[in-house]
Amino acid sequence: MEDFNMESDSFEDFWKGEDLSNYSYSSTLPPFLLDAAPCEPESLEINK
């Protein structure tokens, strides 16, 4: 485990999968687990 490394201001979710993750690396996502207000659109609820 290491501290967050700000090499870029744009991030993609690791686990959501190519068809569900933000493939364009939108910079609206905050660094992982930091105290930032999430700015993502309403999440897709997959399960019925």
């Epitope: 090499e7 190519e18 992982f32 687990l33």
Partner: antibody, heavy 120, light 116 residues
């Protein structure tokens, strides 16, 4: 320094349920999905599903539909995975994991694992 | 037939280069997928090494040395993890994974033994 810290080992009877917790230590739950992955003794990893900590939205693997429930409590930075109607073949180490990628690098975070033993 | 097939075991000497393969089931084109590679040592969770789809779409795990690299073999419909300059600490189980049909699918794993 961010860590995912899981609850301790459990021994359960067939037919019962288990609830495993995963706490973000050194940070708060963000909008990145938290996946749950299990690994039976001597077997490869098996993905169970993920939860979006921000919205609570879930995506469960078909195999576990109807038997697994993933929730989160953002006030205490903790995600939960509950598996019901346990069978002996549910005996495994259960991991939570999360992470994100930039254009050139990925950062993954895993809990230490929780051993769940199902035995009569 | 499994979605992802890996050889169960492989052994090589220190300093050698080894290629670990992850063959996708017929009808699933390797060129359409990011192939994820993990290393796992006894008693520890899997550790992400890298993911590879093409030379323009590849990401290394944080802190993972460059001697771990990815490629693909289109003719064999397989993803490849290349480990160069093999070290004793590389002895571990290696798993590939893909996001397929809205689920993460893992291969059965390859147990890599470093001789000597």
């Amino acid at each position: 320094q961010v860590q995912l810290v899981q609850s301790g080992a459990e021994v359960k009877k067939p037919g019962s349920s288990v609830k495993v917790s995963c706490k973000a230590s050194g940070g708060t739950l963000s909008s990145y999905a938290i996946s749950w992955v299990r690994q039976a003794p001597g077997q490869g990893p098996e993905w169970m599903g993920w939860i979006n900590p921000n919205s609570g939205g879930t995506n469960y693997a078909q195999k576990f539909q109807g038997r697994v429930t993933m929730t989160r409590d953002t006030s205490i930075s903790t995600a939960y995975m509950e598996l019901s109607r346990l069978r002996p073949d549910d005996t495994a180490v259960y991991y939570c994991a999360s992470g994100y990628c930039s254009r050139t690098r990925c950062y993954d975070y895993w809990g230490q694992g929780t051993l769940v033993t199902v035995s009569s | 037939q499994a979605v992802l097939t890996q050889p169960s075991s492989l052994s090589a000497s220190p300093g050698a280069s080894v290629s670990l393969t992850c063959t996708l089931r017929s009808g699933i084109n390797v060129g359409a997928y990011r192939i994820y590679w993990y290393q796992q040592k006894p008693g520890s969770p899997p550790q992400f090494l890298l993911r590879y789809k093409s030379d323009s779409d590849k990401q290394q795990g944080s802190g993972v040395p460059s001697r771990f690299s990815g490629s693909r073999d289109a003719s064999a419909n397989a993803g490849i993890l290349l480990i160069s300059g093999l070290r004793s600490e590389d002895e571990a189980d290696y798993y590939c994974a893909i996001w397929h049909s809205s689920a993460w699918v893992f291969g059965g794993g390859t147990q890599l033994t470093v001789l000597g």
